[in-house]
């Protein structure tokens, strides 16, 4: 049994920690392969995490750390049974994916414009709480051309568009990503989409 | 009532055995850390040794290390320090403590908050 | 190894008076925000030690308010703000950011 891809990890900066590696043939991750971490630091424990497949030469392990600060660092050992495959450490710190905003919400109620809502995935007490940025993708299905992404700068989790900017009579979908600059974060994963219809006219005197 | 008791001290000759021992009680043991300390006749505090909760971790004073093993027994709620070669320098009382909360994936620390009366070793010939 | 030094070795206090106790530690104490991996214990004669304070700033549980703990990174004191006949003994900081855990000398609290 041989390590193909030797496992990479990132944090949520929370209480989540995912490796995912790869295997040289087909394994059943959660049979065969444990992860064991431990915090480098006085009387920790070594803790173990059991993999899932993730395809059929990918395995993805989900470790359940504490809140992470700047000088936290894991010791990592995939072990196959008796026999120790990879050795490597990992500082949650300088990994670090976000997780994904949540419960996007349109509201079209609002006049002339298109409000969108969503929050942030962490909580105040958390240090990414005040340093995430997002990108909103707006795309439409009836219009294969239209795709457009809104980078929201600012804390406040919403964004305005102009109805106006939106064909009227067709359908949208819209998803939210998030990052942060002074963390040096990758981008977290996707929202779920919202769908929205945009049944918005400009006035008479407009047309 | 969160106690912890040794015993084992006593008079011993250079390069002779000792096993102190340290009952625990009041608290769930296995979750917490532990932790020597001595201190010799008119000195200040010395820590010897620790151990993790699970007894996998293990952790020794360069005065007293490949001479002293610290150990655990959970379900007996009891720790231990052998002490081989015995010199000298090693009369004092020592101390068990309670030390941190190792269960959890950064330990949580409070401070050595519990310590036991004291077992006195004397190394003389 | 972390070396702690403490300061003044003796104290003398007239009962009611405040008393400050300084230790420093050769490197930083400090893990993450507010968790700088030093405790207070006081010695009584004939005693064991007990704990004080924890994590720099921490009052043990049934330490009287008169007790304090501050500090951060390598220097820390112990604050005793009215002086009372029974806190009389010695007094010792220790950190346990890392093995071996190490103490300084000690400072003996006497009342004039």
């Known amino acids: 049994m041989k390590v193909l891809q030797e496992p990479a990890c990132v944090s949520d900066y929370m209480s989540i920690s995912t490796c995912e590696w790869k295997m040289g043939g087909p394994t059943n991750c959660s049979a065969e392969l444990r992860l064991l971490y431990q915090l480098v630091f006085q009387s920790s424990e070594t803790h173990t995490c059991v993999p899932e497949n993730n395809g059929g030469v990918g395995c993805v392990c989900h470790l359940l750390m504490d809140d992470v600060v700047s000088m936290d660092n894991y010791t990592l050992d995939l072990w196959a049974g008796q026999q120790l495959l990879w050795k490597g450490s990992f500082k949650p710190s300088e990994h670090v994916k976000p997780r994904a905003p949540g419960n996007l919400t349109v509201h079209t109620n609002v006049s002339d414009t298109v409000l969108l809502t969503w929050s942030n995935p962490y909580p105040p007490d958390n240090y990414l709480y005040n340093d995430l940025t997002y990108a909103v993708n707006i795309w439409s299905e009836n219009d294969p051309a239209y795709s457009r992404i809104h980078n929201v700068t600012y804390l406040k989790p919403t964004l305005r568009i102009p109805a106006s900017t939106l064909k009227s009579g067709i359908s949208y979908r819209a998803r939210v990503r998030a990052w942060a600059q002074h963390y040096n974060t990758t981008w977290s994963e996707w929202s779920p989409s919202t769908k929205w219809y945009n049944s918005y006219r400009e006035p008479f005197e407009q047309r | 009532e969160v106690q912890l008791v040794e015993s084992g001290g006593g008079l011993e000759q250079p390069g002779g055995s000792l096993r102190l021992s340290c009952a625990g009680s009041?608290?769930?043991?296995?979750?917490?850390?532990m932790t020597w300390v001595r201190q010799a006749p008119g000195k200040g505090l010395e820590w010897v040794s620790s151990?993790?909760?699970?007894?996998?971790?293990?952790y020794y004073a360069d005065s007293v290390k490949g001479r002293f093993t610290i150990s655990r027994d959970n379900s007996k709620n009891t720790l231990y320090l052998q002490m081989n070669s015995l010199r000298a320098e090693d009369t004092a009382v020592y101390y068990c403590?309670?030390?941190?909360?190792?269960?959890?994936?950064?330990?949580?620390?409070?401070?050595?908050?519990?310590w036991g009366q004291g077992t006195t070793v004397t190394v003389s010939s | 190894d972390i070396v702690m030094t403490q300061s003044p070795l003796s104290l003398p206090v007239t009962p009611g008076e405040p008393a400050s106790i300084s230790c420093t530690a050769s490197?930083?104490?400090?893990?993450?925000?507010?968790?700088?991996?030093v405790d207070w214990y006081l010695q009584k004669s004939g005693q064991s030690p007990q704990l004080l304070i924890y994590?720099?700033?921490n009052r043990a549980t049934g330490v009287p308010d008169r007790f304090s703990g501050s500090g951060s990174g390598t220097d820390f004191t112990l604050k005793i703000s009215r002086v009372e006949a029974e806190d009389v003994g010695f007094y010792y900081c220790?950190?346990?950011?890392?093995?071996?855990?190490?103490f300084g000398q000690g400072t003996k609290l006497e009342i004039k």
């Open positions: 403590a309670k030390d941190r909360v190792s269960i959890t994936i950064r330990p949580r620390y409070y401070g050595l908050d519990v």
């Open positions: 009041g608290f769930t043991f296995r979750d917490f850390a």
């Open positions: 151990i993790s909760g699970s007894g996998d971790g293990t």
């Open positions: 490197q930083s104490l400090l893990y993450s925000i507010g968790y700088n991996y």
């Open positions: 994590l720099g700033n």
């Open positions: 220790m950190q346990s950011l890392q093995t071996p855990y190490t």
